[in-house]
């Protein structure tokens, strides 16, 4: 599965999307940064097998989806960027999803890391939290589209690496 | 190799006008703010201003507004420090330092080798 | 702004002692302050970044803690290329400022 070629230009264009997102200027929010204990151990790529690795990948974008569903989202965001940011959300599941299909059978390992899913659901349960605990402030949000865009470039390293693989 | 390159040492008269740059390379220019620094001879540090080049927002210290213009070319990866009329009181190393926005990240992590800038009748 | 007040100015030490310096806020900054260190005709480096996080590549004699208005750097065991001028610095708002330095010389 060549997953760069049909993933890594949707993957620029979220971070493109969510770049023009922001309503405030951040500098109005320095005091509001936080340390969400991004699991970058898990975006390393070293101990995965691809299709374990693809799979952090599609938890990661699945649970950035599911943060931009709520309606708390829909109230912050540009409804036209929140449209296209789903879209191009959506097209990367799909090939992951793809990817994942052509995995099996390939690898003798487990599709799944289930304890590397689990760090990635419980990132994003920081991140809700935060929001929680912020009330859904503007500058919350503004922390979390930072946050966001850090981690998709952050995975898209461990793209660049799936791909060297191959 | 992250890297932050400033321009070369200026000599100039009172009156003048002067930009100084900072170019980054190594990284993704739009990820991170670009910080300005004072150091006058013998003294200690002065924040100066801060732009983000990803849509050219600024914020300047109350010390410096209305004195210098902090501006950013994401074309070229390149940040900028500008005087319309130099005084004296401008002689100083001049810094630009990357810092992480609003991400949980090192402030200020790396830094330009520093111009020196010289205003002298 | 935020006034930040670094002591003392100065300190004359030898290598191998235990060196701290201090930094108060004039109000909580919660644990954002940087430590830098330069040395003459240098671009500062950073040491220590959210009050007590090692910056990449610092050796590990150097520490940072502190919350709120009350930080310290510390050098376990004082070494010949750590005399220098140290800098504390506010990241909690804008517009970030920093102590006035304090220069660690050889005794």
């Known amino acids: 599965c060549d997953l760069p070629q049909t993933h890594s230009l949707s993957n620029r264009r979220t971070l493109m999307i969510m770049a023009q997102m922001g309503r405030i200027s951040p500098f109005s929010c320095l005091k509001d940064r936080h340390d969400f204990g991004f699991p970058q151990e898990e975006f390393d790529g070293n101990q995965f097998q691809k299709a374990q690795a693809i799979s952090v990948l599609h938890e990661m974008i699945q649970q950035t989806f599911n943060l931009f569903s709520t309606k708390d989202s829909s109230a912050t965001w540009d409804e036209t960027l929140l449209d296209k940011f789903y879209t191009e959300l959506y097209q990367q599941l799909n090939d992951l999803e793809a990817c994942m299909m052509q995995e099996v059978g390939v690898e003798d390992t487990p599709l799944m890391n289930v304890d590397s899913i689990l760090t990635v659901r419980k990132y994003f349960q920081r991140i809700t939290l935060y929001l929680t605990e912020k009330k859904y402030s503007p500058c919350a949000w503004e922390v979390v589209r930072a946050e966001i865009m850090r981690s998709f470039s952050l995975s898209a390293n461990l793209q660049e690496r799936l791909r060297r693989k191959e | 190799e992250v890297q932050l390159v400033q321009s070369g040492a200026e000599v100039k008269k009172p009156g003048e006008s002067l930009k100084i740059s900072c170019k980054g390379s190594?990284?993704?220019?739009?990820?991170?703010?670009i910080g300005w620094v004072r150091q006058m001879p013998g003294k200690g540090l002065e924040w100066m201003g801060i732009?983000?080049?990803?849509?050219?927002?600024?914020r300047y210290s109350p010390s410096f507004q209305g004195q210098v213009t902090i501006s950013a070319d994401k074309s070229i990866s390149t940040a900028y420090l500008q005087w319309s009329s130099l005084k004296a009181s401008d002689t100083a190393m001049y810094y630009c330092?990357?810092?992480?926005?609003?991400?949980?990240?090192?402030?200020?992590?790396?830094w330009g080798q520093g111009t020196l800038v010289t205003v002298s009748s | 702004d935020i006034q930040m007040t670094q002591s003392p100015s100065s300190l004359s030490a030898s290598v191998g002692d235990r060196v701290t310096i201090t930094c108060r806020a004039s109000q909580s900054i919660d644990r954002a302050l940087n430590w830098y260190q330069q040395k003459p005709g240098k671009a500062p480096k950073l040491l220590i970044y959210f009050a007590s996080s090692l910056q990449s590549g610092v050796p590990s004699r150097f520490s940072g803690s502190g919350s709120g208005t009350d930080f310290t750097l510390t050098i376990s065991s004082l070494q010949p290329e750590d005399f220098a001028t140290y800098y504390c610095?506010?990241?909690?708002?804008?517009?970030?400022?920093f102590g006035q330095g304090t220069k660690v010389e050889i005794k």
């Open positions: 330092a990357r810092h992480p926005g609003l991400n949980w990240a090192p402030d200020f992590d790396y």
């Open positions: 732009i983000d080049p990803s849509d050219s927002d600024t």
């Open positions: 610095q506010q990241s909690f708002d804008f517009p970030l400022t």
């Open positions: 190594g990284y993704s220019f739009t990820s991170y703010w």
